[in-house]
Interface confidence: low
């Protein structure tokens, strides 16, 4: 099946202190490689979450990504602050053997607006 990374919401608005879910689904897990969430684009983009097992305060995967056929790589961000505002991209990589992983497709991005409480 052809790979497609889908972020259904172009934008979400969330009040400071609340939680929000950023949705991302894939049509295929192939080629083998990680999925990562970034804020921003280009060389200065910020890695937000990588499903790699590290502890990231306030961020949690929504579905059980350990399940064999899971295609849902949405994340929940808790206790949102104004610093969390920006455009978030769900990005699929192809695993490199000796060389770094290669980015093969990105979702269209979801802009997070943080509203004052």
């Amino acid at each position: 099946k052809e790979l497609k990374v889908t972020q259904p919401e172009k934008s979400v608005s969330v009040a400071a202190g609340d939680s929000t879910v950023l949705n991302c689904t894939l049509t295929s897990l192939l080629p083998v490689g990680p999925i990562r969430w970034y804020r921003g684009v280009g060389p200065s983009r910020l890695l937000i979450y990588s499903f790699a097992g590290e502890y990231v305060p306030r961020i949690r995967n929504v579905s059980d990504t350990t399940k064999r056929n899971n295609m849902d790589f949405s994340i929940r961000i808790s206790n949102v602050t104004p610093a969390d505002a920006g455009i978030y991209y769900c990005v699929k990589f192809q695993k490199g053997s000796s060389e770094p992983d290669t980015e093969i497709q990105s979702g269209g991005g979801t802009e997070v607006y943080v509203l004052a409480k």
Epitope: A52, E54, P57
Partner: antibody, heavy 124, light 106 residues
Framework: AVTLDESGGGLQTPGGALSLVCKGS????????MNWVRQAPGKGLEWVAG????????YYGAAVQGRATISRDNGQSTVRLQLNNLRAEDTATYYC?????????????????WGHGTEVIVSS | ALTQPASVSANPGETVEITCSGG?????YGWFQQKSPGSAPLTVI????KRPSDIPSRFSGSKSDSTGTLTITRVQAEDEAVYYC??????????FGAGTTLTVLG
């Protein structure tokens, strides 16, 4: 069924070292973060250490920081806790725990399975 | 440490709630049942509201603001135990509550 079998407990001498091993079965071991939790006699639960699914990230409780090392061998489906410079207050039952499909080491809210425990007594 | 009541009691068939607060900004909670000291704990709820497959549907979990709640409906004598909540603080360190003893009356 998910099983977590701990071994390596027993009588230990103060100042010595112990190595506890947990073997997991009934689930895809390499996909799940693991933790060690202990319970001293008559006390509540205390988190000891945690490790991410791929072993790259390790976490330690304040009581064992600098004395403990947690590691895992996904090929053997085992997680190991090494604890050095043992003290009387390390006397406890040590439980191996598995995280469900969320969180990492230290995320105790994600624990979905426990081992039977192995008893450690530190005494001269 | 997390904050939970030291004890709660209920009659068989009643509904009981146990609260837990003080987790980090991640604010997720798990709930663990221990029927006797030295026996292995059992997870009844993890990640706020997920229930392991072998746990009866009488057990449910929820979170509102920064407080987690374990709810046991139609309490039975076999539910008598100490219930611990668990979470993580903002540094990623695991934290437990001191435990809540549930006494089933009658």
């Amino acid at each position: 069924a998910v099983t977590l079998d701990e071994s390596g407990g027993g009588l230990q001498t103060p100042g010595g070292a112990l190595s506890l091993v947990c073997k997991g079965s009934g689930f895809t071991f390499s996909s799940h973060a693991m933790n060690w939790v202990r319970q001293a006699p008559g006390k509540g639960l205390e988190w000891v250490a945690g490790i991410s699914s791929d072993g790259r990230f390790t976490y330690y409780g304040a009581a064992v920081q600098g004395r403990a090392t947690i590691s895992r061998d996904n090929g053997q489906s085992t997680v190991r806790l090494q604890l050095n410079n043992l003290r009387a207050e390390d006397t406890a039952t040590y439980y191996c725990t598995k995280n469900g499909g969320c969180g990492s080491g230290g995320d105790l809210d994600c624990i979905d399975a426990w081992g039977h425990g192995t008893e450690v007594i530190v005494s001269s | 440490a997390l904050t939970q009541p030291a004890s709660v009691s209920a009659n068989p068939g009643e509904t009981v709630e146990i609260t837990c607060s003080g987790g980090g900004s991640n604010n997720a909670y798990g709930w663990f049942q221990q029927k006797s000291p030295g026996s292995a704990p059992l997870t009844v709820i993890y990640d706020n509201g997920k229930r392991p497959s072998d746990i009866p549907s009488r057990f449910s979990g929820s979170k509102s603001d920064s407080t987690g709640t374990l709810t046991i409906t139609r309490v039975q004598a076999e539910d008598e135990a100490v219930y611990y909540c668990g979470s993580a603080d903002n540094s990623g360190a695991g934290v437990f509550g001191a435990g809540t003893t549930l006494t089933v009356l009658g």
